[in-house]
């Protein structure tokens, strides 16, 4: 190889070892029979060299730096050339560096031809290996503007006082043009301006200078977004940190054409604007930091540009002014991320403050709209607390657990509506009475309705899940000892049509000691499957549950257990089951940790099944599944 650099070219070529590899054989640059690992060639020098190995690209990199001095004479503006031409260089990973020094009063503009640039964050890399690293200068301090790949939206970067541009090309890349030009501009009076151009729908992720380190103190950086008038842009902050300010306040300012309040000033922690039509500017302004504990200001944000949706012009009123202790969250439903561009899906408060999540609280009337291509990408989760603090006031009081119609009218699917039902400890218990009798979801007889009620203890230390229940069964009521959460969970969009089937009333009743009592009135037509709470994890230690099973006069009930033994092994105490006839009070007691479970038994009158657990050893839990089937009596035994 021969590299000859013209005099006065202000170019330096440096060949040096790249990142160390685990290659056993070393490789050298050989020059005049000398083996070296670094070679520096300056303007006016001509050097002939070879490599001592077959694949020098696995060992060495080449840096070509051109210093452009705009301080002492005219600046060579225009398209920037790759010098020396890549065809004259050894095939190594190469980095072309242009270091432009200029007066503080002179603005320098880097213009990128198509494809434009896409900024990448720390730890990311470019698919084709071609990266552009751009930095500026504040006095003697170097400021990293960012690292960029091809195929993005960044078309121009304006700076002043100097710019350093490094173009990294992998050894196999055929590129032989720089892809950018330099122009002079008047002073921009800030650190830099980045112009981002959208031709159509798309997104851009951008970062403050020096990201992920701190933005320079008391500096100003602006992003100019060029967006076709027929599209809408939304800004979301992906990541930010605030420094400790001594004077002034860190903020972002938007210049939005057509806004009567330009510039619109936002704190970084505010919801950022969405649904903006056409071009806009965003500026990040730092503050004077506390010298002792400066902290860092940094920002990573995304601009999403998409077509306005039909829904974006509709305003929905959610009236929660008469509600208490309630919150409604609209959020994205979990999905697998795809690699192609996905338009944003935002919910907007008062049409401007848009974000992917929105929580509305009780006590107010809210106006919301949607900026979303497909509203099935969102769902709603609601929480409401009904609590009783004074047992004398609450006793026998009833509340209807029903989804308010305002919520059902929203164009977003309801996922969960959770009622937290709180009672004074050891004073009151709760009874749930459904509008339509409930079926317990089991593997043997799964629920196939569009919604279910999930009933679980709401006591933090207690891991007790009573089960999932849907309309169309035999459970007439569920009594529970203490605080519970009842969650209406929907499984299909058809819930809207079936909403009339929902309806659950909760009443506060005198306190009882059992964890739960299920009142079951089987229908003659079907087999009722019942299972102990906390299925798969086992009934909690020392917990007692009962089923009150009604048997009509002309029927006989067959009680069947689905395994021979309960499988529970007690560490302390005993686990037992009592089957008690309600009329005669006759009872059978089974030791669940010793006896086999009873064979199918026939009951001519209503009866109780009570199951009480011991403290089981781990892995040997108490899980029971049983069924009740009614058949007509053939002989009247009365």
């Amino acid at each position: 190889f021969e590299i000859a650099l013209p005099r006065e070219s202000n170019i330096t070529v440096l060949i040096k070892l790249g990142t160390p590899t685990l290659l056993a054989k070393p490789c050298y640059i050989v020059i005049s029979k000398r083996h070296i690992t670094m070679l520096s060639i300056k303007s006016g020098e001509r050097i002939v060299f070879t490599f001592s190995c077959q694949s020098p690209e696995n060992h060495f990199v080449i840096e070509i730096q051109k210093n452009i001095d705009c301080m002492s004479g005219p600046c060579p503006f225009g398209e920037v050339q790759l010098q020396p031409s890549t065809s004259l260089l050894p095939t190594l990973n190469r980095t072309f560096i242009w270091d432009v020094k200029a007066h503080k009063s002179i603005g320098l503009e880097l213009q990128f031809s198509i494809p434009r640039l896409r900024q990448i964050g720390p730890g990311e890399s470019c698919p084709d290996g071609v990266t552009h690293s751009i930095s500026g200068r504040i006095d003697a301090t170097v400021v990293r503007i960012g690292t960029f790949c091809s195929n993005g939206t960044v078309s121009r970067i304006k700076m002043q006082e100097g710019v350093k541009m490094a173009l990294h090309l992998p050894w196999f890349h055929p590129r032989n043009v720089s892809g950018f030009s330099i122009a002079n501009r008047s002073s921009i009076k800030r650190l830099c301006i980045i112009e981002s151009v959208f031709e159509g729908e798309g997104s851009a992720t951008l970062m403050s200078a020096n990201y992920p380190e701190g933005f320079p103190e008391d500096e100003l950086m602006t992003w100019q977004f060029v967006v076709p008038a027929h599209l809408r842009a939304s800004v979301s902050f992906l990541n930010f940190n605030l420094s400790n300010c001594e004077r002034k306040e860190e903020r972002v300012e938007y210049y939005i054409p057509g806004s009567t309040t330009n510039p619109e000033v936002f704190k970084l922690e505010d919801k950022q604007p969405g649904n903006m039509a056409g071009n806009f500017n965003l500026s990040l302004q730092g503050c004077d930091q506390d010298a002792q504990s400066p902290g860092i200001l940094r920002l990573q944000f995304q601009v999403l540009v998409q077509h306005p949706q039909n829904e974006s012009n509709k305003i929905y009123v959610v009236d929660l002014s008469n509600e208490r202790a309630m919150s409604l969250t609209i959020e994205p439903r979990p999905v697998k991320q795809s690699r192609k561009f996905v338009p944003g899906c935002f919910v907007c408060l008062e049409s401007r403050t848009c974000s992917s999540n929105l929580t509305l609280t009780s006590g107010s009337k809210h106006k919301i709209s949607f900026l979303c291509d497909d509203l099935t990408r969102l769902w709603m989760n609601v929480e409401k607390t009904i609590s009783c603090t004074d047992h004398r006031y609450c006793q026998r009081k009833s509340y209807s657990l029903q989804v308010p119609s305002d919520i059902l009218h929203l164009p977003v699917e309801l996922h969960d509506f959770s009622w937290k039902l709180l009672v004074p400890k050891d004073r009151l218990s709760l009874v749930l009475v459904p509008a339509q009798k409930l079926q317990q979801h089991t593997h043997e007889k799964p629920c196939n309705t569009s919604f279910s009620y999930l009933v679980a203890s709401a006591i933090p230390s207690q891991d007790l899940y009573f089960g999932s229940f849907c309309p169309g069964g035999s459970i007439k009521q569920i009594q529970v000892k203490q605080n519970i959460s009842v969650t209406l969970r929907t499984f299909a969009p058809s819930f809207q049509q079936e909403a009339s089937r929902q309806g659950l009333t909760v009443s506060f009743i005198p306190y009882f000691k059992e964890e739960g009592v299920f009142t079951v009135t089987p229908d003659t037509k079907s087999k009722v499957y019942l299972r102990t709470p906390n299925w798969d994890r086992g009934l909690p230690s020392l917990t007692s549950v009962s089923w009150n099973i009604s048997v009509p006069r002309d029927q006989v009930a067959c009680l069947t257990f689905f395994k021979e033994r309960s499988g529970v092994v007690c560490q302390t105490g005993r686990a037992f089951m009592i089957i008690q006839e309600q009329r005669t009070r006759a009872e059978e007691i089974f030791s669940l940790d010793e006896d086999v479970l009873p064979k199918p038994s026939f009951h001519h009158h209503s009866f109780w099944v009570n199951i009480s657990n011991c403290s089981p050893t781990s892995g040997k839990q108490l899980d029971l599944l049983f069924s009740v089937t009614l058949t007509p009596r053939t002989v009247d035994l009365t």
């Epitope: 070393p26 050298y28 050989v30 020059i31 029979k33 000398r34 083996h35 070296i36 690992t37 670094m38 070679l39 520096s40 001592s52």
Partner: antibody
Framework: EVQLQESGAELARPGASVKLSCKAS????????MQWVKQRPGQGLEWIGA????????RYTQKFKGKATLTADKSSSTAYMQLSSLASEDSAVYYC???????WGQGTTLTVSS | NIVLTQSPASLAVSLGQRATISCRAS??????????MHWYQQKPGQPPKLLIY???NLESGVPARFSGSGSRTDFTLTIDPVEADDAATYYC?????????FGGGTKLEIK
Amino acid sequence: EVQLQESGAELARPGASVKLSCKASGNTFTNYWMQWVKQRPGQGLEWIGAIYPGDGDTRYTQKFKGKATLTADKSSSTAYMQLSSLASEDSAVYYCTTSPAHYWGQGTTLTVSS
Amino acid sequence: NIVLTQSPASLAVSLGQRATISCRASESVDSYGNSFMHWYQQKPGQPPKLLIYLASNLESGVPARFSGSGSRTDFTLTIDPVEADDAATYYCQQNNEDPWTFGGGTKLEIK
């Protein structure tokens, strides 16, 4: 993997000559200097000289000019060092090594004794 | 001839501590922006083994506890932390100028 295989131990009379060999395998023999180093028992390392097999260029330390002659045979990737007019102070271990010295031979012990 | 002076001639270092060996050249061994100084380790009955080449490049397979630094006339080999297996004699060599020369060696003992 590069290996340098040196010839076996030599016993020679004073005044005689010996030719030590060093065969390189798995290496681009012509692209590296081959240097020879002497080490007497309990002593340090002493550079004798080097040869660039690509063009036969040789370098010697003053003390070994006339004592050592370095040659190389590209076809067999072998370097040779001939030591002449042997005296008892030539008794030592002689190493061949590439330069840069990533690879060393196991050493040849030369004993000069009457 | 370039004379290489190694110091100290011998050195005793406790296990886990740092060992520093110096090599001073009578004139600069730098050319083409490279320092033509190399460091070797030799144990009794074995050929020397390359540790560091061109002043600061770690030879493949050599633990990162070994490092080399310096330029022009002053060079240092550092072993940090020292292990029992590091007991050996260490040599520096320059090949910037004919004749190539070795330092006198430094014997490292582990306490």
